[in-house]
Interface confidence: low
């Protein structure tokens, strides 16, 4: 028995004085405290406990259930206690069969003794299966058996308590671990949406996943800058063992433009926290803003393509698009289509592929697109650009040479003569007249320019040449004539068309 | 390479309803929009409905608003049309196609014939008076 100084409170005294006794099952247990402040034997085995005030405890028939720690306690809180087994061949073992162990920790396969004096106290797999090589155990007569540093391997693991009892294996009844995961990692969190775009009175209904290895995660939606409660709901599920996935669902039912903003989906465990963010976005209409991806004035050479492309946003999603021209809707030569594969795209792209472009054209291209709520158009301005053609070359009554040319950019008209046999023109002379004839008509045509000279100031015979030129090329038209005595006999126009 | 199967056509008198289905293979389904088109004997191709990715948004000719209704399960990769009310107008041979153009997740549904790559061999219904 413990010894203390005098004068000092000193812990209660027990008879018989050892620290452990071994009766057989049937036998009497006789426990005396011995203590002026004696308070209470108890006792403890397993989950059990039971108390006693009187300072004598005894058991008459001793069953291998009072297998345990008996304590007696004085008033000064001080205490002394005795192990007694109650040995009974028939239960080897007392067994709480619940196995919980934390991952990296260890824990305890209750399976205390009734015996002491078995041997190869330790653990074995059911169905004569190997425990897992790096198990570690300690056993423990009067606790159990200690499993040393948990592994998530180790989960649903079936094992029996084992002894040798003369010279046979004994097991206790079975035991499966069950293994709650330590969290190694923050929680995985993801959300279905990362934007949305609604009309006001539409709901708002977002969700997010939250993933970790059990379902101890905390979860939360919160809104950023507020402290407001959202409404979530949860589904849950178990994918294998160490495997679970959650679903909050957050909702508006009827968003309004003040409910635009961001929302955190918020997660954490012991290891860390995680966040996921959506931004709600809440128009009071639908859109359609159109942007150019060209110039919208385009000028383009005579038989030229050139692809008129515009890029727009449109919420709702656009129902109707046409490309149109001198009210006439293009049927085909045109696509439209999503700017991006994101599910909240709102971006859309139309081509007009015009080919082989014409003289005549040129004109006002307008796109035109709608959705539910608005329409929105957008016009481009195409001029094409054509080498002069002379329309007319001849000799008015007045004696005046005329040339009419036509292109676009307007046509420069220059007048050169020739004398006698020369090739080359250079002499140039100038214009009695110069006028644009259709400027007042729509500005995408070609524009038609009339020059005149007066023949009357040509004395010698030769050759006049009529040029007409813009940016895209020239053409030219020429009058042959020759003089017979004082007259001019013969005026013969012709042209020579040059690239 | 994507395999378009239309069944369900048949003969049907006026007023009466017929449903047709299109199984489709070979691509992700579920991606892209899908869309059934008609061809009458002499006339061109026409649009008759479509649907989008998720069946979220749908797009029915001026011709069959409020008599027809696409649907589509991605789970069995089938698109189907109900069509009610029939009128001998409607008879034409119903061709199914795959908007491989379109983008998942946009809800974009087109009638353009030309955005639609893939094509089924299409199933005849007959509309008598």
């Known amino acids: 028995q413990p010894s203390v100084s005098p004068g000092e409170p000193s812990p209660p005294s027990i008879h018989p004085g050892k620290s452990d006794l071994i009766v057989r099952v049937g036998d009497e247990i006789r426990l005396l405290c011995t203590d002026p402040g004696f308070v209470k034997w108890t006792f403890e085995i397993l989950d059990e406990t039971n108390e006693n005030k009187q300072n004598e405890w005894i058991t008459e028939k001793a069953e291998a259930t009072n297998t345990g720690k008996y304590t007696c306690t004085n008033k000064h809180g001080l205490s002394n206690s005795i192990y007694v087994f109650v040995r009974d061949p028939a239960k080897l073992f007392l067994v709480d069969r619940s196995l919980y162990g934390k991952e990296d920790n260890d824990t305890l396969v209750r399976c205390p003794l009734t015996d002491p004096e078995v041997t190869n106290y330790s653990l074995k797999g059911c169905q004569g299966k190997p425990l897992p090589k790096d198990l570690r155990f300690i056993p423990d007569p009067k606790a159990g058996i200690m499993i040393k540093s948990v592994k998530r391997a180790y989960h649903r693991l079936c094992l029996h308590c084992s002894v040798d009892q003369e010279g046979k294996s004994v097991l206790s009844e079975k035991f499966i671990l069950k293994v709650r995961p330590a969290f190694k990692a923050v929680p995985v969190v993801s959300v279905s949406k990362a934007s949305y775009l609604l009309r006001e009175g539409e709901e708002f209904t977002v969700t997010c996943t939250i993933k970790d290895v059990s379902s101890s995660v905390y979860s939360t939606w919160k809104r950023e800058n507020s402290q407001t409660k959202l409404q979530e709901k949860y589904n849950s599920w178990h994918h294998g063992d160490f495997n679970y996935e959650r679903q909050a669902t957050l909702t508006i039912s009827s968003a309004r433009v003040n409910d635009s903003g961001v929302f955190m989906c918020y997660a954490n465990n012991t290891f860390g926290s995680a966040n996921v963010t959506t931004t709600l976005e809440v128009v009071d209409k639908g859109f359609i803003n159109i942007f150019p991806m060209i110039n919208t004035t385009v000028f383009v050479n005579d038989g030229e393509n050139v692809d008129l492309i515009v890029e727009y946003e449109a919420f709702p999603k656009p129902e109707h698009q046409q490309w149109i021209y001198m009210n006439r809707t293009f049927t085909d030569k045109w696509e439209d289509y999503p700017k991006s594969e994101n599910e909240s795209n709102i971006r859309y792209v139309s081509e007009l592929h015009l080919t082989r472009l014409k003289g005549t054209e040129g004109g006002t291209y307008t796109f035109l697109v709608s959705n539910s709520d608005v329409n929105a158009a957008i016009a481009f301005n195409v001029y094409v650009n054509t080498k002069p053609e002379i329309l007319t070359y001849d000799r008015l009554v007045n004696g005046m040479l005329q040339c009419v040319a036509a292109g676009f950019p307007e046509p420069t008209i220059d007048w050169y003569f020739c004398p006698g046999t020369e090739q080359r023109c250079s002499a140039s002379v100038l214009p009695v007249d110069v006028q644009t004839l259709n400027s007042s008509g729509p500005p995408f045509g070609k524009l038609v320019v009339q020059s005149s000279i007066d023949s009357s100031a040509f004395k010698h015979n030769g050759t006049v040449e009529c040029k007409a030129y813009n940016d895209v090329g020239k053409t030219s038209a020429y009058f042959n004539f020759a003089f017979k005595g004082n007259n001019k006999e013969q005026i013969h126009p012709h042209t020579l068309f040059t690239p | 390479q994507v395999h378009l199967v239309e069944s369900g056509g048949g003969l049907v008198q006026a007023g009466g309803s017929l449903g047709l289905s299109c199984a489709a293979s070979?691509?992700?389904?579920?991606?892209?929009?899908m869309g059934w088109f008609r061809q009458a004997p002499g006339k061109e191709r026409e649009f008759v409905a479509a649907?989008?990715?998720?069946?979220?948004?749908?797009l029915y000719a001026d011709s069959v608003k409020g008599r027809f209704t696409i649907s589509r399960d991605n789970g069995e990769n089938t698109v189907y049309l109900q069509m009610n009310s029939l009128k001998p107008e409607d008879t034409a041979v119903y061709y199914c196609a795959l908007d491989s153009t379109g983008v998942y997740g946009t809800g974009y549904v087109s009638s353009r014939k030309g955005r639609y790559e893939y094509w089924g061999q299409g199933t005849l219904v007959t509309v008598s008076s």
């Open positions: 070979g691509h992700t389904f579920s991606n892209y929009a």
């Open positions: 649907i989008s990715w998720s069946g979220g948004s749908t």
